[in-house]
Structure formats: C-alpha cells, structure tokens
Interface confidence: medium
C-alpha cells in the first residue's frame, strides 16, 4: 500500500490518502452515471470484510471494456498485495449472487465511507 502512487502527485501516498482518493473516484462514478454503468454488467457480490479490496478487484476485473471503472480497478490493485487476473475466485465472493456493477460500487462506497470514518485505512 505504501507504494501506491497518487494520481495527482507521484511518489508514495499515505493509506488515508489512498482510501480517500478511492472513495472520491467511487463517488465520481455514482455521480456521473447517466446510462447503466458498464451496460448493466453483473459481477460477483463480495463479503465486505478483511481482504475485501482483493475480492472487489477480483469481481471488477472480470468486467472488460468499461472505461468508467478502469481507474477504480487500478486503485484497488494498489490495495491488494497480490496480482489479480480475470477468472480468479476468492472465498470472499458470495457464491451464486451476482449484482449489477452500479450496485456493487454503491455497496463498496458505503462500506469504505464507514471504514474511513472509523480510521481504518489499511
């Protein structure tokens, strides 16, 4: 996480800054949503617990050709200690439950806001 580069300035950024920037990007996505996000693509729902950043990335990385979430995918990769590729499946996914990307983003945003408020930046 300490290696996560800021998008406004190069070099390492503190975990609180990285989380804040991720939240701001998710807010930006929900604000600018004119048509169905990613054409209504469905992704695996995840348990919002420890390890959720990797799980979130594993879900979203399977959505291709959706420029609206590319920045989010890059940001999430900075929070995940291992390399994630399409087709990976984590135990944190809620099996047999798929939701629209728009709902996934809203749920993730809600949870990240809670973490930020509580000072849980890692």
């Amino acid at each position: 996480l300490t290696c996560l580069g800021g998008f406004a300035s190069p070099g390492p950024v503190p975990p609180s800054t990285a989380l804040r920037e991720l939240i701001e990007e998710l807010v930006n996505i929900t604000q600018n949503q004119k048509a169905p996000l990613c054409n209504g693509s469905m992704v695996w729902s995840i348990n919002l617990t420890a390890g959720m950043y990797c799980a979130a990335l594993e879900s979203l990385i399977n959505v291709s050709g959706c420029s609206a979430i590319e920045k989010t995918q890059r940001m999430l990769s900075g929070f995940c200690p291992h390399k994630v590729s399409a087709g990976q499946f984590s135990s944190l996914h809620v099996r047999d439950t798929k939701i629209e990307v728009a709902q996934f983003v809203k749920d993730l945003l809600l949870h990240l806001k809670k973490l930020f408020r509580e000072g849980q930046f890692n």
């Epitope: 998008f7 804040r20 809600l110 806001k113």
Partner: antibody, heavy 121, light 107 residues
C-alpha cells in the same frame, strides 16, 4: 487554531467578474476537500461548488454552472472562486467550508466568516 | 437532485423546553446528513454529523437520529443561547442540498 478566512467580496455590476479567496490555516489543507456555500440576504444556505483534495473532482450547483470556477492552490493553502457573468441573484454572503471526503464524510465541519458579494448597477 | 424539507419552518419555545426538528430527504441518503446552527450575522456551526454523531464541543443536550429519508434534531432542554436558525444538509450526492431552515425563537 483551525481557521478559514474569505476575502475578495465587494460591489460589482451585473455581467461583471469577481474572484474570491479563502485562506486556510491550522490544518493540512491538502488533505481536505473544500466547498463554497452562499447565503442571499434573509434566505437559506445554498451549496455552490466542491473541489476534491487532489484537484481531481469538481462539482457545481446548477445555478452557477458555466459561470463560476472553483480552484485551489495547496502550496498556498488557498481556495478560490472565480465568478463571471454575475447576476443580481448572485448577491450573497459567500462562505468556504471544509470537507473530509466529498459526498461522504462529515461535510462542512469548519466554516469561514464569509465575504459579502453585491451585484447591482 | 435530492430535495430536503424541514419542519416546522419556525417555532416558539421557552427555556427548558424540549424541541424537535424534522428533516426529510426526497430519496435515501443513508446517514450522510449534518445539522447546523446559525445565528444572525454569523457563519453556520456544525452540531451533528453522520446523522447522529455529536460534534466535539457541542453540548450533549443536542442529539440527532434517523437514517435513509427521515432525520430528527432534538434539543433536550432549550437554553437561551440556542435561539437560532437550524439547517439540515445532505452530503450524499451532488448537488449538496440544505433544508430551508427552522427558526427557533423565544415564546
């Protein structure tokens, strides 16, 4: 002491321009998103604009979109509002207000004292 | 845009009274709501954030509750310095919107 101090208000003719400034002190300005809020005489509060901590995200209220521009200089701990094509209905006290993270957390915890903008011929 | 309505628009009360102000959002905003107090000629002051969390330094007679679309600010025992106008603010989505305000004056 955490403080926000606005300046730049004054009397301007309709169609004119004005640039407001907000000087921040007592906290790490670059870690906070910032907003402008205004209040017309005898009226309620109206949110005007938002800028994220790292300049990446900017939003405006419909009534000022295309006329006002929000900006910031983190090196100078300053927030700005460039107001063009001013109208009589823009007459108000303008406040800058601190924000944790846009549209999410504990918005508007610290406010400046306000600067008065009067648009009149 | 999310519309915020506040009731009542004004109220007269006496020192020691329990005062309740309600704010409604036109759509769900979770707990992204703050309550502000404003006195004439002064900047607003935050009392409550995240719908129910008390701002540091604010007396405990102020409390907030609610989630989703309906929120309440309660002053358990009104004090002379509490006579002011109170606003709610939703900061769930842009444009941020304030309620029209509730003026609390002396009966």
């Amino acid at each position: 002491e955490v403080q926000l101090v606005e300046s730049g208000g004054g009397l301007v003719k309709p169609g004119g321009s004005l640039r407001l400034s907000c000087a921040a002190s007592g906290f790490t300005f670059s870690s906070y998103s910032m907003n402008w809020v205004r209040q017309a005489p005898g009226k309620g509060l109206e949110w005007v604009s938002y800028i994220s901590s790292s300049y990446n995200y900017i939003y405006y209220g419909d009534s000022v979109k295309g006329r006002f521009t929000i900006s910031r200089d983190n090196a100078k701990n300053s927030l700005y509002l460039q107001m063009n094509s001013l109208r009589a209905e823009d007459t108000a006290v303008y406040y800058c207000a601190r924000d944790q993270v846009g549209a999410t957390l504990d918005a508007f915890d610290i406010w400046g004292q306000g600067t008065m903008v009067t648009v009149s011929s | 845009d999310i519309q915020m309505t506040q009731s009542p628009s004004s109220l007269s009360a006496s020192v020691g009274d329990r005062v309740t102000i309600t704010c409604r959002a036109s759509q769900g905003i979770g707990d992204d709501l703050g309550w502000y107090q404003q006195k004439p000629g002064k900047a607003p002051k935050r009392l409550i954030y995240a719908a129910s969390s008390l701002q540091s330094g604010v007396p405990s007679r102020f409390s907030g509750s609610g989630s989703g679309t309906e929120f309440t600010l309660t002053i358990s025992s009104l004090q002379p310095e509490d006579f002011a106008t109170y606003y709610c603010l939703q900061h769930n989505s842009y444009p941020f919107t304030f309620g029209p305000g509730t003026k609390v004056d002396i009966k």
